[in-house]
């Protein structure tokens, strides 16, 4: 008799999830000499241990501590780039500006980027059919808790000037409910972080508005200033030119406003 399986509202675990995590780990540790000591089988075992046989609505940050310990990594604390709703451009930027890092440029972020996973209570099976949706089912699901945990740690590690890339095409350029707005902003340490610099990325070619005047940006400014961190805001009117100028800063067209 087939066993009854909980039907969740979100997509199931990404196919070939264990193989993908293991392969990503091997690739990452080969490319990054400072992480060559990492045993990828142990990393997978710790990852698996965080959610296998556990109710997928009852995951805690503590479940991920063994994985966090194995994935401990030092990135230059003054070279951190946060992002919200504009992941692709943020990643394109750090691929060019190699001394800056998004969360997904770290081992743990790289392992989990764009993946979904969950298990089932009291069985060692991975659920490939469905996983809990953050809104419709529960917030303490394996994926959400993972990103909350690594995002908090990443923000806590930041120092000096922290940059954040925000999507100027969204109705809420700064969204209090995003990972950046709900986790990272509140875990920047005023004793270490002097300034948060927001880069508001424009979508339209002819969009010359000053999006730093947007009410949601002023809300971010208020939150940050109350935490005794300076706030800076810059419009990136031409993201294509912005990337080009990161690649070729000597280009004569790169002295004007981007």
């Amino acid at each position: 008799v087939p066993r009854w399986r909980q039907q969740w509202s979100g997509p199931g675990t990404t196919k070939r999830f264990p193989e993908t995590v293991l392969a990503r780990c091997v690739k990452y540790t080969e490319i990054h000499p400072e992480m060559r000591h990492v045993d990828c089988q142990s990393v997978w075992d710790a990852f698996k241990g965080a959610f296998i046989s556990k109710h997928p609505c009852n995951i805690t940050e503590e479940d991920y501590q063994p994985l966090m310990k194995l994935g401990t990594q030092t990135v230059p604390c003054n070279k951190i780039l946060l992002w919200s709703r504009i992941k692709d451009l943020a990643h394109q930027f750090t691929q060019v500006q190699r001394d800056m890092f998004t969360l997904e440029d770290t081992l743990l972020g790289y392992l989990a980027d764009d993946l979904t996973w969950c298990g089932e209570f009291n069985t060692s099976k991975i659920n490939y059919q469905s996983c809990p949706d953050w809104r419709k089912d529960c917030s303490n699901n394996p994926v959400s808790v993972f990103w909350k945990t690594v995002s908090r740690r990443f923000a806590e590690a930041a120092c000096d000037v922290v940059h954040v890339m925000l999507n100027g095409s969204r109705s809420k350029i700064f969204d209090k409910n995003s990972t950046f707005g709900s986790v990272e902003v509140h875990n920047l340490q005023p004793e270490k972080v002097q300034t948060l610099e927001a880069w508001v990325i424009h979508g339209g070619r002819e969009d010359s508005r000053d999006l730093c005047q947007d009410p949601t940006i002023k809300e971010l400014e208020s939150i940050i200033s109350k935490r005794n961190i300076q706030f800076s805001c810059k419009n990136i009117y031409r993201p294509d030119k912005f990337l080009q100028c990161v690649k070729n800063p000597e280009d004569s067209s790169c002295t004007s406003e981007i």
Partner: antibody, heavy 119, light 107 residues
Framework: EVQLKQSGPGLMQPSQSLSITCTVS????????IHWLRQSPGKGLEWLGV???????DYNAAFMSRLSITKDNSKSQVFFKMNSLQGDDTAIYYC?????????????WGQGTTLTVSS | DIQMTQSSSSFSVSLGDRVTITCKAS??????LVWYQQKPGNAPGLLIS???SLETGVPSRFSGSGSGKDYTLTITSLQTEDVATYYC?????????FGGGTKLEIK
């Protein structure tokens, strides 16, 4: 080019009110905060208060009861008013621009308004 | 309020000297420190922020260091145009406060 130009009186009597206007160019008051400071031989440099780009203000508690900072974004002007002047308010008064949007230190300063309080 | 103390109010120096100016806060200011240079008749000008970051156009003979409560401004080889008064300012907490200044004078 960023500039801050101050206008205001030079000599005032005790108990009078000091009013200084700081007119800025080269940037918008909706993008940066404007701070007010003063410098005297006796007390050195003192931070008095700030009006942030959104219009909210923070004042040095020692001056809060007699200080008011307002602005008119459309005219690029910031207005400083200090009541109940006494002899020890004799100083050079400066407006200054915050280095970043919400900056706690200053990259451009006005030329200064020299105030002497004397009867 | 946080008190900022610059121990020497004036220094007699020679051109080419290495000059060190110190600034001590009454409590930890977590690297929220800037240095200004002021010449007679002028407003102060921003020199260094965040303890070590030189402002655009500031010569590389200027450098800043320190942490916690203790901070230092160093001029490696004093030039004529460096003769001025130097102030530190903390921006960890309001009211933002300044040191009393250190005036450099030529011997």
């Amino acid at each position: 080019e960023v500039q801050l130009k101050q206008s205001g009186p030079g000599l005032m009597q005790p108990s009078q009110s000091l009013s200084i206007t700081c007119t800025v160019s080269g940037f918008s008051l909706t993008s940066y905060g404007i701070h007010w400071l003063r410098q005297s031989p006796g007390k050195g440099l003192e931070w008095l208060g700030v009006i942030w780009r959104g219009g909210s203000t923070d004042y040095n508690a020692a001056f809060m009861s007699r200080l008011s900072i307002t602005k008119d974004n459309s005219k690029s002007q910031v207005f400083f008013k200090m009541n109940s002047l006494q002899g020890d308010d004799t100083a050079i008064y400066y407006c200054a621009k915050g280095k970043v949007t919400t900056g706690f230190y200053f990259d451009f300063w006005g030329q200064g308004t020299t105030l002497t309080v004397s009867s | 309020d946080i008190q900022m103390t610059q121990s020497s109010s004036s220094f007699s120096v020679s051109l080419g000297d290495r000059v060190t100016i110190t600034c001590k806060a009454s409590e930890d200011i977590y690297n929220r420190l800037v240095w200004y240079q002021q010449k007679p008749g002028n407003a102060p000008g921003l020199l260094i922020s965040g303890v070590t970051s030189l402002e655009t156009g500031v010569p590389s003979r200027f450098s800043g260091s320190g942490s916690g409560k203790d901070y230092t401004l160093t001029i490696t080889s004093l030039q004529t145009e460096d003769v001025a008064t130097y102030y530190c300012q903390q921006y960890w907490s309001t009211p933002y406060t300044f040191g009393g200044g250190t005036k450099l004078e030529i011997k």
